[in-house]
């Protein structure tokens, strides 16, 4: 099939989870092809390594695309030390990397 | 690790998870053991646009996964989206309502 760029979404940790002392930030890459995609996490513009995990779906039987979730996991204390959370996505279907971000505590 | 039921947290739709006419929302199913869990949406009445990702094994020895669904953004304020999580090994069933974050 032809190249399909991912749709990228970012989710902050829920208030429920923060009450438990942990913060998971999720970046979703939806319906892309080919499978190769790179996700980089940045916290206050500092590149993160070693504290995220990725999971990729099987190839979709209808449109042959893939989807990927990347989860950045931090302690609540670490999460609350920083403001800007961003996932940067690189993929063949994107002319330049796409960044989705949010400011902690803001809608 | 001994048997442990998951915690289920909402991945709430917001302007950061909306693109044009599409909104994404989901559930984070975290810290369970052993595999597997099953996730459905609206008791199986919503299947189109659903992606339930393979579980990942965390450093804690517990599993975690996310299930997400894309929906028309126009539907967010008019109906309820619920993820139904079942972890048979711990006899845990959780129905989590996922709503737009109220600011």
């Amino acid at each position: 099939r032809t190249v399909a760029a991912p749709s990228v979404f970012i989710f902050p940790p829920s208030d429920e989870q923060l009450k438990s002392g942990t913060a998971s930030v999720v970046c979703l890459l939806n319906n892309f092809y080919p499978r190769e995609a790179k996700v980089q996490w940045k916290v206050d513009n500092a590149l993160q390594s070693g504290n995220s995990q990725e999971s990729v779906t099987e190839q979709d039987s209808k449109d042959s695309t893939y989807s990927l979730s990347s989860t950045l996991t931090l302690s609540k204390a670490d999460y609350e030390k920083h403001k800007v959370y961003a996932c940067e996505v690189t993929h063949q279907g994107l002319s330049s990397p796409v960044t989705k971000s949010f400011n902690r505590g803001e809608c | 690790a001994s048997t442990k039921g998951p915690s289920v947290f909402p991945l709430a739709p917001s302007s950061k998870s909306t693109s044009g006419g599409t909104a994404a929302l989901g559930c984070l199913v975290k810290d369970y053991f052993p595999e597997p869990v099953t996730v459905s949406w609206n008791s199986g009445a919503l299947t189109s646009g659903v992606h339930t990702f393979p579980a990942v094994l965390q450093s804690s020895g517990l599993y975690s996964l996310s299930s997400v669904v894309t929906v028309p953004s126009s539907s967010l304020g008019t109906q309820t989206y619920i993820c139904n999580v079942n972890h048979k090994p711990s006899n845990t069933k959780v129905d989590k309502k996922v709503e737009p974050k109220s600011c």
């Epitope: 749709s7 | 044009g20 304020g77 109906q79």
Partner: antibody, heavy 110, light 110 residues
Framework: QSLEESGGRLVTPGTPLTLTCTAS????????MNWVRQAPGKGLEWIGT?????SAAYASWAKGRFTISRTSTTVDLKAASPTTEDTATYFC???????WGPGTLVTVSS | DVVMTQTPASVSEPVGGTVTIKCQAS??????LAWYQQKPGQPPKLLIY???TLESGVPSRFKGSGSGTEFTLTISDLECADAATYYC????????????FGGGTKVEIK
Amino acid sequence: QSLEESGGRLVTPGTPLTLTCTASGFSLSTYWMNWVRQAPGKGLEWIGTINIDGSAAYASWAKGRFTISRTSTTVDLKAASPTTEDTATYFCATYGGDIWGPGTLVTVSS
Amino acid sequence: DVVMTQTPASVSEPVGGTVTIKCQASQSISTALAWYQQKPGQPPKLLIYGASTLESGVPSRFKGSGSGTEFTLTISDLECADAATYYCQCTYYGNNYGNAFGGGTKVEIK
């Protein structure tokens, strides 16, 4: 932001027909889209919906009679073997109903 | 598919009067209901979505209410420009619901 349907014409029964919906001022690719029709002097009739990954849902009466598909820039409605009962104005619209095309007239007659 | 039953089929009221249109869904659709106004030769125009939320630019004389299976559109202080046919539509997103329209209500202004 607007939609426009094209492809409506006079056809004989059984002649395959494809209608196309295109958008101006916004990208169709992130929108669920509906096809709706209206026979002369009659009410609105939902045909089906296509979601962003190309999966379509149809009214029970439309299954097997119509096929909805999409590209990155268009949404198509195909009638494989139209009958005289399919004579109508066909509209495409966003799922939320806030944007409609003006409609395109299909006349099926021998 | 959800079936939408709309009543009455037609109604005639004087300028300044009030019209009430009812729409019943065959199963619960929460507040996933839209109301449209359509004039001859034009596509439908969205008036209300989410059962009660007024679309931008629509006068507050139009009021939607209801949830579950029973819905109402009320038009007060009728004006000549309100002469049109009004439709309800199920906008619930999920398997086997569909986005059916009610049969329409023709509103005439005396």
